[in-house]
């Protein structure tokens, strides 16, 4: 989905006085797009500008992050009179121009996503050559992705007194809820640790103490799907050890 | 004016393979993508592969039907690519189009002529 | 696979309009963008590109070619039809690999 609140930015850098006064620099991209992992997204972005007919050299940037500042994902840059903006750089490969810039069209498309492509997003376009003249959105387009639940980790680690534990890692976004089932334990949420500073999709549920031998189920869920995984205990009884 | 030629078409035996070449000119051939499209006789279009440019690093999509069987490349000196297809099958027999898209765009702008393969023993 | 769907054959009188459609098994648009593209093929030669993303005509084409739709369901006009526009329509879709394309629309004169 796409919401329709626009942003117009209207931070103006170096206008010269080739300016005719109908246009001024704006940028209209919506606040969210929302994307599934693994599916492709739009990010859409238009410009007005006040150099009437400019067909001088420019460049379409986008960032990641935050503007003027944050980390190039894309840039192209069309030459004098061209219509071809000729990609310079497309990070991972994954980001392609859809507009054209020359009809004031910047929109990109972000192909193969990850939760990791869950960030803010800033378009930018600069003109060279007789004008010299830049914009950049200022509050940008949140690309939000959205994911089916995966678990990451699962495992079985050693506690003090000879007991043991079982963590399960998940990723989702939504985060997921993650529940443990295993021998006397019925269904228990099992001490869920908030998502990581960080790592905001990833979710953390602890067994703390096993106290049966058997098998222990992490199921993870969210309003896309659900996943889940399981760790085999067996104790050597009389001896310290266990194989998981 | 973008030409597209391909050539290496024929007869070939079931189980056999063949190389497809496509020379370009007329345009900046670093600049865009390349594929392949085959249409079998009085049939539809289907899409076979895309090589994708440097910037692009080059990557390769096939469609599932021909994965394995199938292997495209570039040569951005020579502004040609080719098609690798090996284990023919008689459902292979299609003439087979070179055509270019942009980088933004998985539309196909300009295509060859078109080169006949026919698979039959 | 997204699959297209377009009637067989049009007949379609010289100087009328001819609206052809193709429909798609899922949505083929993002955020506005629409990546469904049409294609016209004579006899003998190779497809030329008419349509790219849903409603730009291509460098060359004729005003009187024009695509509209959004989600799944998308139509090339012609208007008013001529006698060189005889020939068979495609769709193709881009919104997910492998890209496909419809079987063909074929115009013909009533």
């Known amino acids: 989905f796409v919401r329709t609140k626009i942003d117009t930015t209207e931070n103006l850098l170096n206008t010269e006085v080739h300016s005719s006064p109908a246009q001024r620099w704006s940028m209209q991209v919506p606040p969210e797009v929302s994307a599934e992992a693994g599916d492709a997204a739009v990010l859409p972005c238009t410009f007005t500008h006040p150099h009437r007919h400019y067909d001088g050299p420019l460049t379409a940037i986008w960032r990641a992050g935050e503007p003027y500042a944050g980390p190039q994902v894309f840039r192209c840059a069309a030459a004098r009179g061209s219509e071809l903006c000729q990609t310079a750089l497309s990070l991972h490969g994954r980001f392609r121009l859809l507009g054209n810039p020359r009809r004031n069209d910047l929109s990109l498309r972000v192909e193969r996503l990850a939760l990791a492509d869950d960030r803010r997003y800033f378009c930018r376009v600069e003109f060279a050559g007789d004008v010299h003249d830049r914009y950049e959105s200022r509050h940008g387009v949140r690309l939000h992705v959205t994911a089916a639940p995966r678990i990451v980790n699962i495992s079985v680690l050693p506690s003090p007194a000879h007991a043991f534990r079982a963590l399960c890692t998940a990723e989702g976004e939504p985060p997921p809820a993650l529940a443990w089932s295993g021998p006397a334990l019925g269904n228990s949420l099992a001490a869920v640790r908030s998502p990581r500073e960080g790592h905001g999709h990833l979710v953390t549920a602890e067994l703390p103490a096993l106290t049966h031998d058997g098998r222990y189920t992490c199921t993870a869920a969210n309003s896309l799907g659900r996943s889940e995984a399981s760790v085999y205990l067996f104790r050597f009884h009389g001896a310290s050890g266990a194989s998981t | 004016e973008v030409q597209i030629l391909e050539t290496g078409g024929g007869l070939v035996k079931p189980g056999g393979s063949l190389r497809l070449s496509c020379a370009t000119s007329g345009f900046n051939f670093n600049d865009y993508f390349m594929n392949w499209v085959r249409q079998a006789p009085e049939k539809g279009l289907e899409w076979v592969a895309q090589?994708?440019?440097?910037?692009?690093?080059?990557?390769?999509f096939y469609a599932e039907s021909l994965e394995g069987r199938v292997t495209i490349s570039r040569d951005d000196s020579e502004s040609s690519v080719y098609l690798q297809v090996s284990s023919l099958r008689a459902e292979d027999t299609a003439i087979y189009y070179c055509?270019?898209?942009?980088?933004?765009?998985?539309?196909?702008?300009?295509w060859g002529q078109g080169v006949m393969v026919t698979v039959s023993s | 696979d997204i699959v297209l769907t377009q009637s067989p054959a049009l007949a379609v009188s010289l100087g009328q309009r001819a609206t052809i459609s193709c429909r798609a098994s899922q949505s083929v648009t993002i955020s506005g963008y629409s990546f469904i593209h049409w294609y016209q093929q004579k006899p003998g030669q190779q497809p030329r590109l008419l349509i790219y993303?849903?409603?730009n005509l291509a460098s060359g084409i004729p005003a009187r070619f024009s695509g509209s739709g959004s989600g799944t369901d998308f139509t090339l006009t012609i208007n008013p039809v001529q006698a060189d526009d005889i020939a068979t329509y495609f769709c193709?879709?881009?919104?997910?690999?492998?890209?496909t394309f419809a079987g063909g629309t074929k115009l013909e004169l009533r």
């Open positions: 090589i994708r440019n440097k910037i692009y690093t080059y990557a390769t």
């Open positions: 993303r849903a409603s």
């Open positions: 055509t270019r898209s942009l980088t933004g765009g998985d539309y196909f702008d300009y």
């Open positions: 193709q879709q881009s919104r997910k690999s492998p890209w």
